[in-house]
């Protein structure tokens, strides 16, 4: 906490500019008007303040806005955002996607910090759902964002937002998350034709039930083994040898390399040896 001291004569800051970098902490506290700072926040980022000086500026804003900063200030926080605690951020009401982008830009290239997580949480809760534009923005900055959400949080994602999801955004999702996302994806892509539909739905198939896999096997989709290995074991087990052969197409020979891995291992054990032999891969049930 900086002690309250009078501003020396001639030092009162008429505006936020580079001359302030030469001010001591107590001078910043005494000579910079908090309201002026709030209206000229966009200038702060262009000035090479020390971390200690930034602490003083934050303190001034905290005093001016004890209930939380207005969005007009938040949007221009820049590097001052890194000084905010999750507790500070919980007081904010961020509704503009531009504000969100501006703050995510400050943290770009770093892991998702507790501050960023709190910011995103506040933003999404304020919007009521994870709409397509928000999801687009969040996955652009954090490809693993979607998979960091709980199944309960994912249930608030509307099917229309699924169009924003890229395959890499689902890389770290577990089966419980895909169970929630798959029906949404199925709904979102339902009007696409066979081959286009498969390209879009492929990344979500870890949540697909047996009947949908059986349906896909009738559509010449040629599923690769990487996708097949992500399928739910309980969804794969009821498939016949003929259905798996149709589902994988030319990739069926890849079953050999994965014969000891789930779900292939468990599926093989469910099949009659005569049926497996028709594949000519040397699979032993």
């Amino acid at each position: 906490e900086v002690e309250k001291t009078a501003c020396p004569s001639g030092k009162k800051a008429p505006e936020i500019d580079e001359s302030l970098i030469f001010y001591k902490k107590w001078e910043l506290e005494a000579c910079v008007d908090a309201a002026l700072l709030a209206t000229q926040m966009d200038r702060v980022n262009a000035i090479p303040f020390t971390y200690e000086q930034l602490d003083v500026l934050k303190h001034k804003l905290d005093e001016l806005y004890p209930q939380g900063y207005p969005e007009s200030v938040i949007q221009h926080l820049g590097y001052l955002f890194l000084k905010m605690s999750p507790e500070d951020i919980r007081k904010w009401n961020v509704t503009s996607l531009e504000t969100l982008k501006a703050l995510l830009e400050v943290n770009k290239g770093h892991e998702m910090s507790p501050q960023v997580a709190t910011l995103i949480d506040r933003f999404v809760k304020g919007r009521g759902q994870l709409d397509k534009d928000t999801l687009d923005t969040l996955t652009a900055f954090y490809p693993g964002y979607l998979c960091s959400l709980s199944p309960e949080e994912l249930s608030s994602v509307p099917p229309s937002s699924i169009w924003a999801v890229r395959p890499q955004d689902l890389d770290t999702c577990d089966p419980r998350q895909l169970d929630v996302l798959y029906p949404k994806a199925r709904l979102a892509f339902q009007n696409m034709n066979g081959s286009e539909y498969f390209v879009k739905i492929q990344s979500f198939l870890g949540g697909a039930p047996t009947e949908d896999l059986k349906a896909l096997s009738q559509q010449n989709v040629s599923m690769d083994l990487a996708t097949f290995m992500k399928l739910r074991t309980d969804a794969v087990l009821p498939l016949t040898v003929a259905e798996v052969q149709k589902l994988l197409g030319p990739h069926v020979e890849g079953l050999k390399a994965e014969e000891r891995h789930r779900p292939v291992r468990d599926w093989i054990l469910r099949q009659r040896q005569d049926d497996l032999d028709t594949l000519g891969l040397g699979l032993q049930g």
Partner: antibody, heavy 119, light 108 residues
Framework: EVQLQQSGPELVKPGASVKIPCKAS????????MDWVKQSHGKGLEWIGD????????IYNQKFNGKATLTVDKSSSTAYMELRSLTSEDTAVYYC????????????WGTGTTVTVSS | QIVLTQSPAIMSASPGEKVTLTCSAS???????LCWYRQKPGSSPELWIY???NLASGVPARFSGSGSGTSYSLTISSMEAEDAASYFC?????????FGGGTKLGMK
């Protein structure tokens, strides 16, 4: 560019353990299994086992059961192999190698980590 | 487990000479499930030939692979200095996956 970066040489005492990281970059980590191979002067190349990064499902060469433990951290695209109860027999170069799911050949190999077990 | 025996263990060849390395399996291997790696001293192995006869990316066309059942081979139609290395065959037809002992090929 696809790379599998392994850590530098390790000198460890008999009975100790060592954990070797293999940091993958330049490809989708979950589309490939990660296999581990031992290369020693006496025995040539030996397959230790593999892990599927999607399911953490592992398969081991029986010879290395209880000796090696394979794990992955999807968030950092890193595979690990821990070797325990080390003896002079475990002195070797250990490689991680990626294997496209559905194939059995290793199309990219790691830089190799030399483990020397000596008191 | 399937034992892969490579012969010769060590050999050298003159520039332009045709070279054949062999890999013999203790029991039958499906040809899709056999491949070859090349390793230069101080370097990691690299995939050279997969599925018995398919050249990996960047492998010169003077290399070829053939075989079936228990007998496989790698052939260099015309030896060049950069081909000096160790070559290992590898099968994934049966668990555990196994490798041959290698052939160390030198330049005369």
């Amino acid at each position: 560019e696809v790379q599998l970066q392994q850590s530098g040489p390790e000198l460890v005492k008999p009975g100790a353990s060592v954990k070797i990281p293999c940091k993958a970059s330049g490809y989708t980590f979950t589309d490939y299994n990660m296999d581990w191979v031992k290369q020693s002067h006496g025995k040539g190349l030996e397959w230790i086992g593999d892990i599927n990064p999607n399911t953490d499902d592992t398969i081991y060469n029986q010879k290395f059961n209880g000796k090696a433990t394979l794990t992955v951290d999807k968030s950092s695209s890193t595979a690990y192999m821990e070797l325990r109860s080390l003896t002079s027999e475990d002195t070797a170069v250990y490689y991680c190698s990626r294997r496209l799911i559905g194939t059995g050949y290793f199309d990219v190999w790691g830089t190799g980590t030399t483990v020397t077990v000596s008191s | 487990q399937i034992v892969l025996t490579q012969s010769p263990a060590i050999m050298s060849a003159s520039p332009g000479e045709k070279v054949t390395l062999t890999c013999s399996a203790s029991s039958s291997v499906i040809s899709t499930y056999l491949c070859w790696y090349r390793q230069k001293p101080g370097s990691s192995p690299e995939l050279w030939i997969y599925s018995t006869s398919n050249l990996a990316s960047g492998v010169p066309a003077r290399f070829s692979g053939s075989g079936s059942g228990t007998s496989y081979s790698l052939t260099i139609s015309s030896m060049e200095a950069e081909d000096a290395a160790s070559y290992f065959c590898h099968q994934w037809s049966n668990y555990p996956y196994t490798f041959g002992g290698g052939t160390k090929l030198g330049m005369k």
